[in-house]
């Protein structure tokens, strides 16, 4: 009686069991009574990569580059080539047929993991302790600064997208400003002691002058580079000195229109 | 139903070629299978002579040297058997044959 | 070339009784892929030789089931389980596992 089923790697025809062709080779003949299935190998640009009774060898896919894909590995008889995104892309499919552009992790994520030819960037949020302020296909989230390292406190607080101020701590803070202060009293006592020199060297006019106003004093009469006919300088909130415009009277103004 | 039917002359002179014709109906000789030439001595003796594949590649007896051509036409299903240079040792009953079908066998004999 | 022996030329039984018929070859018929393309061949008297059995053990089409083959690569048997008036005739064995295909002398099969 005929075969209802063959062995493996065989297969059923005209109530026989053909030998099936090899990976490589394409069916040519089926096996008869008398004679083997007859097979011949696929050609260069061609591949089957099963045992087979098929007619016509498989064309090897093309790895086009205006779709942003190169060979990753050339076909053979056997197995078909594989194709990959070139640089900077990765496969939109499977089949990697197209290529499209790794996606950025946003600030505030991180890369888990970086993307390759076939699988995209894959992003993570920057848990505490951690930040990304940065939008970027390669960057981990990282790690806040640590102040104490530094032998600072920390003035801000870092975010998911920001890192941490640090700033000086307090011994540091007073060491730096008590010098300050101590310099600035030490100016302005120098001046007063100035000063007081300047009131007890002036001898007192004896003089009368009965008619004449209380004249105003000006301490700075003496000072290297002062005019006394100079009108006095205005200042401004930021101690800045302003020089008097010409032209114009020495008096506190009404805001001047623009 | 796959049939073979043969066809030629029965008297060859020695030194002459022999030519004889296979019709096959039922199937085409281009499909599959390897199409055979056959003789049969007196006394029952079988001798495989050659064959023309499906493809039209061929494969003889080298016993038969270089006197022996199979050819065949596609358009009309035949396939053809020449022998050259006969002589009477030739003298054998010739049968066409995919193997599991055979013509009805062409007795052939060499004489002057 | 492989040489095929049939060593029983005449074998004589009588009806009902079992046939075994016996072809030796001078070398293994087993190709590479494992099948023994060896065929056995019934020629009836005035007729031309008709399938029986190929590749060792496989009936052809319309074949008995009384018929069946056996054997390895180089012994190979048919066997008529039941021998029947209309089973006389002259059998052949042929291999086309190698080329030159050969057949075997023949063996005839006589009713007592």
């Known amino acids: 009686e005929p075969p209802t089923a063959c062995r493996e790697k065989q297969y059923l025809i005209n109530s026989q069991c053909c030998s099936l062709c090899q990976p490589g080779q394409k069916l040519v003949s089926d096996c008869t009574e008398f004679t083997e299935t007859e097979c011949l190998p696929c050609s260069e640009s061609e591949f089957l990569d099963t045992w087979n009774r098929e007619t016509r060898c498989h064309q090897h896919k093309y790895c086009d580059p205006n779709l942003g894909l190169r060979v990753q590995q050339k076909g053979t008889s056997e197995t078909d080539t594989i194709c990959t995104c070139e640089e900077g892309l990765h496969c939109m499919s499977e089949s990697c047929e197209s290529c499209v552009p790794h996606r950025s992790c946003l600030p505030g994520f991180g890369v888990k993991q970086i993307a390759t030819g076939v699988s995209d960037t894959i992003c993570e949020p920057c848990p505490v302790g951690f930040f990304s302020n940065v939008s970027s296909a390669f960057e981990k989230c990282r790690p806040w600064t640590s102040c104490e390292t530094k032998d600072l406190v920390v003035q801000q607080a870092g975010t998911n997208k920001t890192d941490v101020v640090c700033g000086p701590q307090d011994r540091q803070r007073a060491l730096v400003v008590i010098p300050i202060c101590l310099g600035i009293l030490f100016v302005i006592l120098l001046l007063v002691l100035v000063f007081i020199k300047k009131v007890a060297k002036k001898p007192n006019d004896k003089a009368p002058h009965p008619k004449q106003e209380p004249q105003e004093i000006n301490f700075l009469d003496d000072l290297p580079g002062s005019n006394p006919a100079a009108p006095v300088q205005e200042t401004l909130h930021g101690c800045q000195p302003v020089t008097q415009e010409d032209g114009k009277e020495s008096r506190i103004s009404v805001q001047e229109r623009q | 139903e796959v049939q073979l039917e043969q066809s030629g002359p029965g008297l060859v002179k020695p030194s002459q070629s022999l030519s004889l014709t296979c019709s096959v109906t039922?199937?085409?000789?281009?499909?599959?299978?390897?199409w055979n030439w056959i003789r049969q001595f007196p006394g029952n003796k079988l001798e495989w002579m050659g064959y023309?594949?499906?493809?039209?590649?061929?494969n003889y007896n080298p016993s038969l040297k270089n006197r022996i051509s199979i050819t065949r036409d596609t358009s009309k299903n035949q396939f053809f058997l020449k022998l050259n240079s006969v002589t009477t040792e030739d003298t054998a009953t010739y049968y066409c044959?995919?193997?599991?079908?055979w013509g009805q066998g062409t007795s052939v004999t060499v004489s002057s | 070339d492989i040489v095929l022996t049939q060593s029983t030329l005449s074998l004589s039984v009588s009806l009902g009784d079992q046939a075994s018929i016996s072809c030796r070859s001078s070398?293994?018929?087993?190709?590479?892929?494992?099948?023994?393309?060896l065929n056995w061949f019934l020629q009836k008297p005035g007729q031309s030789p008709q399938l029986l059995i190929y590749k060792v053990s496989n009936r052809f089409s319309g074949v008995l089931d009384r018929f069946s083959g056996t054997g390895s690569g180089t012994d190979l048997t048919l066997t008529i389980s039941r021998v029947e008036a209309e089973d006389l005739g002259v059998y052949f064995c042929l291999q086309v596992t190698h080329v030159p295909f050969t057949f075997g002398s023949g063996t005839k099969l006589e009713i007592k």
């Open positions: 039922g199937y085409s000789i281009t499909t599959n299978y390897h």
């Open positions: 023309i594949k499906y493809d039209g590649s061929n």
């Open positions: 044959a995919r193997l599991d079908y």
């Open positions: 070398q293994s018929l087993e190709n590479s892929n494992g099948n023994t393309f």
